[in-house]
């Protein structure tokens, strides 16, 4: 009953593949290897990720699960979604934040923190774009507001106002009384 | 903590037969494959069996195959060595290992002597 | 059969030395190969498994390489509890083959 190598596994079923001697199933997603199978297409020995470890996919090899992330409290991240045995906790802003990038190449798993959204109102502007992947972006001055240097200014509310030229294209029809 | 005791060792005349243990403790037995490996005296090691977790699979060295048969009580935590037609040149200390290719636990060895 | 060439069969170093032992297979056997040391009248004790992995509670001063046909094993510092024989052992496939051991003493 000598063993030969098999170069691909002659096994019914998916999932197999050589561990050592044998070829072998695999462990599904949230479980670990505890033991490698020990005849030929067997099932080998799994086991449930702990808690605060997950493994997201089907593995032959993992003898650990891996550690959930922890979100940043000090980058003012938050648990969108919490971790379990299949998946890694989803870190990010809580509503009225947006992820700021710590690298220019921003992938998915970058480095970020949380960075509170513009308040166009506040700042007496239109919401041209909602704030969620980036900053709000604020559009133009709310009516009854002019652009003066960064900012909106109110009209004035008399003639005694000093009106510039600008205010006066905005606000013009209230110089007439 | 894991233990394996190997016995049954001693003396035999050439052509004679004997029945090694190793009892094993510390660990779900039931889930490991098993070995026997041997070491003459001064020499190197020699893998001679191997027995799959539930027993349905066995393997042996060519040096051993038709002599030797492996097998194991799962209910009793206990692996066994029946040796038939024993030969000078099968004296060596036997161990039993945990694993299934890999070895992580041996037991201390028992000596055979086969000698007329 | 696998055949599992180790050398030197054995070495002489001193203790803080760097020692080194190789094992060729006479195959390909991936990375399925362990490292075993072997004190007189003790049985072997893995160190290292799929040729690089080192085995809980051994000392970091032990690693391994290799892949394929030739491997290695290192020692970075020897020390004087070192002495022992080791042996590497292909598990890619039966018969299990060991290699024929490499002796270790203190110069």
């Known amino acids: 009953q000598g063993g030969t190598r098999s170069p691909r596994c002659d096994c019914a079923g998916d999932f197999h593949k050589k561990i050592g001697l044998f070829c072998c199933r695999g462990c599904p997603a949230g479980h670990y290897l505890k033991a490698p199978c020990t005849e030929p297409c067997g099932n080998s020995t799994c086991l449930v990720c702990p808690q605060d470890t997950f493994l997201a996919w089907e593995n032959h090899h993992n003898s650990e699960c891996a550690r959930c992330q922890a979100c940043d409290e000090q980058a003012s991240q938050v648990a969108l979604e919490n971790c379990s045995a299949v998946a890694d906790t989803r870190c990010g802003c809580k509503p009225g934040w947006f992820v700021e990038c710590q690298v220019s190449q921003c992938v998915s798993s970058s480095p970020f923190y949380c960075q509170p959204c513009l308040d166009c109102g506040a700042l007496h502007r239109h919401t041209r774009l909602l704030c969620s992947r980036r900053d709000t972006d604020c559009g133009t001055c709310l009516p009854g507001f002019y652009e003066h240097g960064d900012g909106c200014v109110s009209c004035p509310t008399s003639t005694l106002g000093s009106c510039p030229e600008r205010c006066a294209a905005v606000c013009g029809w209230r110089q007439m009384f | 903590e894991v233990q394996l005791v190997e016995s049954g060792g001693g003396s035999v005349q050439p052509g004679g037969s004997l029945r090694l243990s190793c009892a094993a403790s510390g660990f779900t037995f039931s889930s490991y494959g098993m070995s026997w490996i041997r070491q003459a005296p001064g020499k190197g090691l020699e893998w001679i069996s191997y027995?799959?977790?539930?027993?349905?699979?066995?393997y042996y060295a060519d040096s051993v195959k038709g002599r030797f048969t492996i097998s194991r009580d799962n209910a009793k935590n206990s692996l066994y060595l029946q040796m038939n037609s024993l030969r000078a040149e099968d004296t060596a200390v036997y161990y039993c290992?945990?694993?299934?290719?890999?070895?992580?636990?041996w037991g201390q060895g028992t000596l055979v002597t086969v000698s007329s | 059969d696998i055949v599992m060439t180790q050398s030197p069969s054995s070495l002489s170093a001193s203790v803080g030395d760097r020692v080194t032992i190789t094992c060729q297979a006479s195959?390909?056997?991936?990375?399925?190969l362990s490292w075993y040391q072997q004190k007189p009248g003790k049985a072997p004790k893995l160190l290292i498994s799929?040729?690089?992995n080192l085995e809980t509670g051994i000392p970091s001063r032990f690693s391994g390489s290799g892949s394929g046909t030739d491997f290695t094993f290192t020692i970075s510092s020897l020390q004087p509890e070192d002495i022992a024989t080791y042996y590497c052992?292909?598990?890619?496939?039966?018969?299990?083959?060991f290699g024929q051991g490499t002796r270790l003493e203190i110069k």
């Open positions: 052992q292909q598990y890619d496939t039966l018969p299990i083959t």
């Open positions: 195959q390909d056997i991936t990375n399925y």
């Open positions: 799929d040729a690089s």
């Open positions: 290992a945990r694993g299934s290719g890999s070895f992580d636990y």
């Open positions: 027995i799959s977790s539930s027993g349905g699979h066995t």
